[in-house]
Amino acid sequence: AFGISGVQKYTRALHDSSITGISPITEYLASLSTYNDQSITFALEDESYEIYVEDLKKDEKKDKVLLSYYESQHPSNESGDGVDGKMLMVTLSPTKDFWLHANNKEHSVELHKCEKPLPDQAFFVLHNMHSNCVSFECKTDPGVFIGVKDNHLALIKVDSSENLCTENILFKLSET
């Protein structure tokens, strides 16, 4: 991997960025696990989905998530109207019509049923991290990443570049 990109310090939020195409550039079905190899699982409870971070029993099947990749313009921080290159954004869908959403008020990660076009809360900047890991930065809240807290997914504020290697915001994607 290229290593770790630093924390987005721009005053202009990532939600000023524009998704170049309405349709994804590619899609990828993968299981999602933490840096410490705990699995991210999804369970239907009382007509809504809950997200868990847990150790699976041997031979227990991992839940899969559909990652849809989008190309996006990255807003320039210094020239108000400039565009500063390209980024890759993803949406994550564990089951039909449900997507991971960033709830910035509650600092939580939730599964919401919604129709396309998806809201900005469903988009995450994908970071290519060291040790074959990735991280997911909220489009709507730069510097805030999906992370693990108390065996659940939560939104975690990363306040400096050095903290980007914190294990609780690192995830592994695998086809198996």
């Epitope: 290229f2 990109s5 310090k9 900047v125 994908l126 903290n163 994607l173």
Partner: antibody, heavy 119, light 111 residues
């Protein structure tokens, strides 16, 4: 405007040392992974080294490991390449490059600085 | 390390013609469902310029006549109709893993 300006190149004898600098402007420097890529005269491109945005990780091509050190000073918006025990085969134009936001590819390149290793 | 082989070494064409450049990797450059293969253009005395990232996506400000395709180990850069400013050297590069490697380049020259 995003800009990378390299300096510090020149003529040096085999076994000598040189420190290259890259001054960055027009973007939040600390937010990006930075690299050095070189090109020998009339030849192709070769990746040399990368440093992550948090200074947490560095990677090098095998041929320079133990001789070259990549570093950065985010307060000065500067990238460096300390080159020791230089060899004739290190003669090249050295480009400073910035990854895209998210670290997937080399997106921005400087104009380069020429390093000549010769007796 | 992943070795990238470009062909042909030189392509002699006239303005307005279609250019097709090939890049073959010694192993798959796919990671996380992405083909991490990029294309750069370099003119004499200038630094390289990003044309295509992740196999098929144009960099900022790159004209629509440039397109990329392919997956796994075989990739193609196509210039649909050559403009005078397109005569240059083109490099493919993989960003799947360290060491990041480049192809040896294809020179597109005026016939």
């Amino acid at each position: 405007e995003v800009q990378l300006v390299e300096s510090g190149g020149g003529l040096v004898k085999p076994g000598g040392s040189l420190r290259l600098s890259c001054a960055a402007s027009g973007f939040t420097f600390s937010s990006f992974s930075m690299s050095w890529v070189r090109q020998a005269p009339g030849k192709g491109l070769e990746w040399v080294a990368t440093i992550s945005g948090g200074k947490t990780f560095t990677d090098y091509v095998d041929s320079v490991k133990g001789r070259f050190t990549i570093s950065r000073d985010d307060a000065k918006n500067s990238l460096y390449l300390q080159m020791n025990s230089l060899r004739a085969e290190d003669t090249a134009v050295y480009y400073c490059t910035r990854a895209n936001y998210g670290d997937w590819f080399f997106e921005v390149w400087g104009q380069g600085t020429l390093v000549t290793v010769s007796s | 390390e992943i070795v990238l082989t470009q062909s042909p070494a030189t392509l002699s064409l006239s303005p307005g013609e279609r250019a097709t450049l090939s890049c073959r990797a010694s192993e798959s450059v796919a990671k996380y469902g992405l083909s991490l293969l990029n294309w750069f253009q370099q003119k004499p005395g200038q630094p390289p310029r990003l044309l295509i990232f992740a196999a098929s996506n144009r960099g900022s400000g790159i004209p629509a006549r440039f397109s990329g395709s392919g997956s796994g180990t075989d990739f193609t850069l196509t210039i649909s109709s050559l403009e005078p400013e397109d005569f240059a050297v083109y490099y493919c590069q993989q960003s799947k893993e360290v060491p990041f490697t480049f192809g040896q380049g294809t020179k597109v020259e005026i016939k």
